[in-house]
């Protein structure tokens, strides 16, 4: 990946838009297509006051853990979808796009140095375990994806890119 491509806000906005489209295509979280089993996903809620005061290295750990769990979740959803009879083509397309998007974001974050932080996280023993919740519909899964990108990931890259500029 070109160095620091993630620091171009248009790049992340493209993936956010894809995630929002996927959420919209699943027709709302109440009546949309259900997952045949619950999938564990990261809790995307953020205390933004506290987040802004975290060290960028600590933010990187949370982002990387969230991204890993999200990737697992969407791969799991893909497997469940493949096993279902007559999967909707549009849904399959958005799952594929999400998997591709997460792979790209993972590569872009590696360039930014986020993975280094996971290898040797600061005060690893004190790091709070990643909060999770369960998704039972494709809509909820895509909403978590969208909220994760718009929340923790965007905030982290903003700070990490600003730090890299100095």
């Amino acid at each position: 990946a070109p160095p620091r491509l993630i620091c171009d806000s248009r790049v992340l906005e493209r993936y956010i838009l894809e995630a929002k489209e996927a959420e919209n295509v699943t027709m709302g979280c109440a009546e949309g297509p259900r997952l045949s089993e619950n999938i564990t996903v990261p809790d995307t809620k953020v205390n933004f006051y506290a987040w802004k005061r975290m060290k960028v290295e600590e933010q990187a750990v949370e982002v990387w853990q969230g991204l890993s769990l999200l990737s697992e979740a969407i791969l799991q959803a893909q497997a469940l979808q493949a096993n279902s009879s007559q999967p909707p083509e549009s849904l399959q397309l958005h799952i594929d796009k999400a998997i591709s998007g997460l792979r790209s974001l993972t590569s872009l974050l590696r360039v930014l140095g986020a993975q280094k932080e996971l290898m040797s996280p600061p005060d690893a023993t004190q790091a709070a375990p990643l909060r999770t919740l369960t998704a039972d519909t494709f809509c909820k899964l895509f909403r978590v994806y969208s909220n994760f990108l718009r929340g923790k990931l965007k905030l982290y890259t903003g700070e990490a890119c600003r730090r890299g500029d100095r």
Epitope: K45, F48, Y49, K52, R53, R143, R150, K154, R162
Partner: antibody, heavy 116, light 109 residues
């Protein structure tokens, strides 16, 4: 104790600028972001923007972009909010608020009156 | 941009339970903060991270959040609870804080 003390009331003419100060004491000024929130008479709270006192970077509410400037002087633990091109609708009490796990410490407020 | 909607006023009888709502698109996916403001005073936080109480705030104050609505619940309402209450959250698209319009709580009796 931890407190934020703001500058006194101001009366300004439309089109002028106002600069409100907020002096922090009782804590490490650069360890907490500072937000500015305003409240027009009889109206609700309106968030204007924040500044990171350590680095000086800012983020403003869309409504105030281009008219508001937030700065700080770390040597005297003071944050500033300057609003330009004032209009009568800018008449309000302006608060600075420290960001802990939430807006945990507020200044006493500064009344800015815009009148011709 | 993201908007939070609150009822202009809520009335409750002394000793009864008051519920103040705050509506916003998928607000259940976000943390919500509630501030109490009495006339001529700066706001004071009563609930943070949706349902946590800072020290000094009575247990009578609680918060919940699901779907498109967050709720501040004040049980056994007292005369001293009369105030304006504001919900606050975050606009993910602009990285900015957002306040609701505020609700005036009146305690009757």
């Amino acid at each position: 104790q931890v407190q934020l003390v703001q500058s006194g009331a101001e009366v300004k003419k439309p089109g002028a600028s106002v600069k409100v100060s907020c002096k922090a004491s009782g804590y490490t000024f650069t360890s907490y972001y500072m937000s500015w929130v305003r409240q027009a008479p009889g109206q609700g709270l309106e968030w204007m923007g924040w500044i990171n006192p350590l680095k000086g970077n800012t983020n403003y509410a869309q409504k105030f972009q281009g008219r508001v400037t937030m700065t700080r002087d770390t040597s005297i633990s003071t944050a500033y909010m300057e609003l330009s091109r004032l209009r009568s609708e800018d008449t309000a009490v302006y608060y600075c608020a420290r960001e802990g796990m939430y807006f945990d410490i507020w200044g006493q407020g500064t009344l800015v009156t815009v009148s011709s | 941009s993201y908007e939070l909607t609150q009822p202009l006023s809520v009335s409750v009888a002394l000793g009864q339970t008051a519920r103040i709502t705050c509506s916003g698109d998928s607000i259940g996916d976000k943390y919500v903060y509630w501030y109490q403001q009495k006339p001529g005073q700066a706001p004071v936080l009563v609930i943070y991270d949706t349902n946590k109480r800072p020290s000094g705030i009575p247990e009578r104050f609680s918060g919940s959040n699901s779907g498109n609505t967050a709720t501040l619940t004040i049980s056994r309402a007292q005369a001293g609870d009369e105030a304006d209450y504001y919900c606050q959250s975050w606009d993910l698209d602009f990285n900015t804080y957002v306040f609701g319009g505020g609700t005036k709580l009146t305690v009757l009796g």
